[in-house]
Each structure stands twice: as C-alpha cells, then as structure tokens.
Interface confidence: medium
C-alpha cells in the first residue's frame, strides 16, 4: 500500500477541511502551550505543501514521512526551549525516536486558564463574523487540553458545535436554544476523552496484546451473531486505527477508521443487525454511531462453553497450537453471552481461565486439574455484583452529591498522599457512577458500572503518573489493567499517613463563593472536606457529617447577609474554631 | 467474507490417488474446523471428511471412505487437504470444501457457514 507521497496520499483521502481540522489538533496536542495563530499558520504552511505534492508527487520533500514532515514543521517554532524546556530536546532527534520523544511530553493536566464561556451575543457574532477561525479555535482549546482526544471523533463534536451555532444564533431566545447544546457537548467530551486516555494508556502501558483483548470482549458483545473470525478482522483493525491516534498518526488514524466503518457497513449482514440506521448516516456521524451501536440479541441455543473449554479431551492441544487464537476464542464465546458482564470481568476471567491451563497442561492429569475451572468463576463474579449492589443502594439513599462525598471520604483515607484538585475530581467523576448505572436493570448495571469506573481510575493513573506521590497508586495502577477498580476497592485506610498540619487559610472562604453556580460551590465545600480528611484521617462518618452540615448552613447564612464579606470574615474563625474542638484539632 | 478455493481435482483411474486442496483466504483459518463434501450428479450432498479447529487432532469420516481418505490440515498456510487413495467410480463426484466455527468439528452441513465452489473428481473404470 506504498504511496510515492504520503502526505499527498492522505489529503487526497481525507479533503482538505479534514486534512487541516486534523493536523491542527495534532498540532495542538503536542504543543499545548502554543498561541492559538501560530498553529493555524504552521497548519497553513502544511497545508500548502501538501497541495503541492497533490500536483507534483515527485517534488522536493513530497516523499518524506508525515513524521519527518510534521516533525519539522513544530520544531521551527522559536519558543520551543522557553515554553516547553527540555521538549526542545526532542528536535535534536532524528525520527522514530523525535514523536516518541513529543509524545511523552504530552501532559495530560496542562497548565492552562479555565475555558470560561463568553456571552451567547458574543459568541453568535463571533460565529458569524467568521465561522472557520470560530471552528478551528474549538478544535485547539480541545486538542490542547486533551492531548488523547480522539481526532476523527473531535471532528464529529466539532460538526456538532458547528449545527448548534448555525440553528441556535438565529433562534428567539439563543440562550435557551444554545446553552444547553453546549453543557452536553461539553459533558460528552470530557466523557470522550477519558474513554479514549483509557485505550491509549492501555496501549502505551499494557501492550497491544492487552488492547485486542479489550476490544475481542467488547465487540462480542456487541456483535454476538458476528462470527469469531469476523470478530478478530474487526478487532485487527481496530486496534490499528488506536494504535495510529495514541500514537499522534491522525492523518493515518481518520482514514483508516473510515474504511472501518465502510467495511462495518459494507458487511454488516454478517456483523449486527443492529447498524442497518447508523449507515445511512455521514461519515463521521456513521463512525460515531457504529462505535456507540446497541449490543444486537444473542443467538438462540448457544451450546454450552464447558463443551468446547473444558469437557474436550483436544483442550490442552488446541491450546498449544495456537494458544492466543484459542484464548480469543474462549474470550469470545464467553463474552457473547454475557452482555451483563463488564469487559474487564471478562478478562479476568480469561486470564483465570489461561493461567489454570498454563499450570493443568503441564500437569500428569490435564483434564482432572482444570475439569474445575469454571467453578473459579464464581467469586470473580460476585465481587462485583455485590459492590454494584451495595454501592447502588448508598447512592440511592444519599443522592448524587452525598455520595460523591462518601467516595471522597473513602479515597482520601485510601490514598491520602494525593492532590486535593485530583482526588476532588476523581471522587467527583467516581460518584456520577450513580446517577449513570444504578437507574439501569440488573442485566446492565455490572458492564455499565465496572466498565465505567475502569475509564475514571485511568483518569487517576494518569495523573498520578505525571507526579507519583502514593506507592499504592502506582501499585494500583501498574500491576494489572483488569484488576485496577478491584485492587483500589480493597485499599484499607493508610496506617502510614502522618497528617496533614492544620492551615487555617486551607478553611477561609470569602463572599465570592456566593456567585459560584452550584458545581462550583459543591468543589468549593468538597475541597474542604478532602483537606479536612487529610487533617483528620481518623475522623468519623459522624463528626465529619456535623463538620459539613456546619459548613453548608455558614455558606448559606453568609451568603443572605448584607454585609456578606464581614460575615465570612467573623462567622468563618468561629467555624473553624468549632470544628477543631469537634474534630480534635 | 471467507474465500474457499479447491484444487487438486481430476480425472484417475480405478485404485489410482488424488489429493485435494482447500485454501481459506482468512486470518483466523485455525479457529474454524474445515470439512469436505461430495456431490455426484442427481444425488444429495453428502458428507465426506471433517477436521476439527486449532491443532486438527479430531477428524471424522463418513463410512464409505473410511481407511481410504485422510483430512490433514496445515493452519500455517490456510489449507485443508483430503488425501484419497484406493479411489473407485462410485467417488464420482464435485468435492467442494466447508468452513465453520460454530463448533470444535462437524458433519452436518448446516453447520458449515462457508463454501467453496467445488473440484471434480472423476474416477474410470
């Protein structure tokens, strides 16, 4: 599939528009403290090359790699050492190794301002005043921020962005019409993103073997009437379109996924009867809808497993010949009939399953050791299903906001070593769990759940990563991607934590708080919490309760009074004071 | 889609030997067992020899060929033989190769999701 020209080969593929959206967000996920201008017009520059290797194949530079070109273009850019320090190294490398080198400079908690939103006025006239800088701004504030985001992906948020713009701007009342439209887009990206820093760090972290695994489980659920072999071709592909975004291969990721999801559609009779609607759609509404498509039905009389996997007296030689191939297979058989499961409690149970047949094959009785492996199972199911249980329950008596705060309580105590800002945002983003999965019946609570928990713990990883300050995180997080929710669930308080000095700044708050939106104030109050906790690890449910009931009703009282800075100023050193004789300060 | 291709087909006498070849055109060839049927002008499909998935170790053979053919497999090359020896006129027929991974190994043909288009063999007396 050698091309005289990559580059002229990918434009000509994917259209200019996408051609320069895409490598704008590449652009901008590497260097993500550049000025918003100075992308657009390395982006320029690219894309005029490129125009003219369209014309001329054979012309200067048109052979080179999309590597070696892009790889160029961002280290001609003056203020590489002062903004990025020793990412400026990374040029002195030739390639593979100079994207190796800009890839792990990639940070994935960058330091940059809020977005803040403008006025509907000033955006619609903003929009309407030019619509292509509007759009392209969206995709850098993104890309820059989320330097894993999935680029076809960003290109389907972007067309939507676009929509909301053109249908809201004209509407009566553009607040109503937009705002919303904008809080869910806003939601699904950040959502986006975690679910694609997932697969990334699985890639980067666990291998491509990890990745397959992930991707046979998920897809036989999804398409259990689908053959295992068409299964492996899909998964085959797949793992090549994440392997080429992970690794800032946008130009080569988008195009490989819309040949995915052309083949997807092309074959779909022998996949899912399922995507019939999402491929009458475009392009990238077609991707995004086959990667969100309802599980279809599971065949009718699915014999069963035990037949094949461990009754068969071939177990141990089918194994042996082919021993990924035939866990594949296992993975798929088990997964396609069980929708109710998480994937990753698939993949426990694969590897229960491969490490009894590493140990009974080479046992004197084969047979007689693993004739029991099922029994394995049983627990490795429960767990849970009994956490979901419990945890479903807790968040029904107490409420979203409640539970949140119970989960940052737990987490505190587990690993209090951690950053505040992290653990408010990973308890925050664990306790949405609730409201997400405890609505759905029991068949799909576990897959939403586990699968769900398994992304936002990533969330954790990473940002631990950057700056590693817990061994029990970074034991959590490595040992082994399947059994990170579980190894997190089991953390007891750390008996080794000295507390944290008191500070009374840490506890002063001031009239500002009463204009927050209430997201706002509830981290604003969850910030304290967490910083109590690490005061006081060994307060109790009951005294932090009180603490907080405390702190809500002195927000409150501060907020209606007419002189509302006083009032924080003198009613905060007496809630403080309380607090410390309540928590034995 | 898999792709079935046979060749290997001819004519030969009496007692003489042919050895027939399947070739699947998929990636994941081991995960499916492979079987071969006949089919004589005027008379039902019917089966011949079956290979099981994976390392091939079970195989099964229809009465009427048994100790004269022999399914092998070679998972590295996507490619199942039938090696048929003592050949008589009543083998007469299309051979035509199957692929299915609904089970380890089968003989029934509404097991077998792929086919391939078939190879004569004719045997004179």
């Known amino acids: 599939d050698a091309h005289k020209s990559e580059v002229a080969h990918r434009f000509k593929d994917l259209g200019e528009e996408n051609f320069k959206a895409l490598v704008l967000i590449a652009f901008a996920q590497y260097l993500q403290q550049c000025p918003f201008e100075d992308h657009v017009k390395l982006v320029n520059e690219v894309t005029e090359f490129a125009k003219t290797c369209v014309a001329d194949e054979s012309a200067e530079n048109c052979d080179k790699s999309l590597h070696t070109l892009f790889g160029d273009k961002l280290c001609t850019v003056a203020t590489l050492r002062e903004t990025y320090g020793e990412m400026a190294d990374c040029c002195a490398k030739q390639e593979p190794e100079r994207n190796e080198c800009f890839l792990q400079h990639k940070d994935d908690n960058p330091n940059l301002p809020r977005l803040v939103r403008p006025e509907v006025d000033v955006m619609c006239t903003a929009f309407h005043d030019n619509e292509e800088t509007f759009l392209k701004k969206y995709l850098y504030e993104i890309a820059r921020r989320h330097p894993y985001f999935y680029a076809p992906e960003l290109l389907f948020f972007a067309k939507r962005y676009k929509a909301a713009f053109t249908e809201c701007c004209q509407a009566a009342d553009k607040a109503a019409c937009l705002l919303p439209k904008l809080d869910e887009l806003r939601d699904e990206g950040k959502a986006s993103s975690a679910k694609q820093r997932l697969k990334c760090a699985s890639l980067q972290k666990f291998g491509e073997r990890a990745f397959k695994a992930w991707a046979v489980a998920r897809l036989s659920q999804r398409f259990p009437k689908a053959e295992f072999a068409e299964v492996s071709k899909l998964v085959t592909d797949l793992t090549k379109v994440h392997t080429e975004c992970c690794h800032g291969d946008l130009l080569e990721c988008a195009d490989d996924r819309a040949d995915l999801a052309k083949y997807i559609c092309e074959n779909q009779d022998s996949i899912s009867s399922k995507l019939k609607e999402c491929c009458e759609k475009p392009l990238l509404e077609k991707s995004h809808c086959i990667a969100e498509v309802e599980n279809d039905e599971m065949p009718a009389d699915l014999p069963s497993l035990a037949a094949d996997f461990v009754e068969s007296k071939d177990v141990c030689k089918n194994y042996a010949e082919a021993k990924d191939v035939f866990l594949g297979m296992f993975l798929y058989e088990y997964a396609r009939r069980h929708p109710d499961y998480s994937v990753v409690l698939l993949l426990r149970l694969a590897k229960t399953y491969e490490t009894t047949l590493e140990k009974c094959c080479a046992a004197a009785d084969p047979h007689e050791c693993y004739a029991k492996v099922f029994d394995e199972f049983k627990p490795l199911v429960e767990e849970p299903q009994n956490l979901i249980k419990q945890n479903c329950e807790l968040f029904e008596q107490l409420g979203e906001y409640k539970f949140q705060n119970a989960l940052l309580v737990r987490y505190t105590k587990k690993v209090p070593q951690v950053s505040t800002p992290t653990l408010v945002e990973v308890s925050r983003n664990l306790g949405k769990v609730g409201s997400k999965c405890c609505k759905h019946p029991e068949a799909k609570r576990m897959p939403c759940a586990e699968d769900y928990l398994s992304v936002v713990l990533n969330q954790l990883c990473v940002l631990h990563e950057k700056t590693p300050v817990s061994d029990r995180v970074t034991k959590c997080c490595t040992e082994s991607l399947v059994n990170r929710r579980p190894c997190f669930s089991a953390l007891e308080v750390d008996e080794t934590y000295v507390p944290k000095e008191f500070n009374a700044e840490t506890f002063t708050f001031h009239a500002d708080i009463c204009t927050l939106s209430e997201k706002e104030r509830q981290i604003k109050k969850q910030t304290a919490l967490v910083e109590l906790v690490k005061h006081k690890p060994k307060a109790t449910k009951e005294q932090l309760k009180a603490v907080m009931d405390d702190f809500a009703a002195f927000v409150e009282k501060c907020c209606k009074a007419d002189d509302k800075e006083t009032c924080f100023a003198e009613e905060g050193k007496k809630l403080v004071a309380a607090s410390q004789a309540a928590l034995g300060l | 889609e898999v792709q079935l291709v046979e060749s290997g087909g001819g004519l030969v006498q009496a007692g003489g030997s042919l050895r027939l070849s399947c070739t699947a055109s998929r990636r994941a060839f081991i995960g499916y067992a492979m079987g071969w049927f006949r089919q004589a002008p005027g008379k039902e499909r019917e089966f011949v020899a079956a290979i099981s998935w994976f390392a091939g170790d079970t195989t099964d053979y229809a009465d009427s060929v048994k100790g004269r053919f022999t399914i092998s497999r070679d998972n590295a090359k996507n490619t199942v033989y039938l090696q048929m020896n003592g050949l008589k006129p009543e083998d007469t027929a299309v051979y035509v190769c199957?692929?299915?991974?609904?089970?380890?190994?089968?003989?029934?043909?509404?097991?077998?999701?792929?086919w391939g288009q078939g190879t004569q063999v004719t045997v004179s007396s």
């Open positions: 199957a692929a299915s991974s609904a089970r380890p190994m089968s003989g029934r043909s509404d097991e077998y999701h792929y």
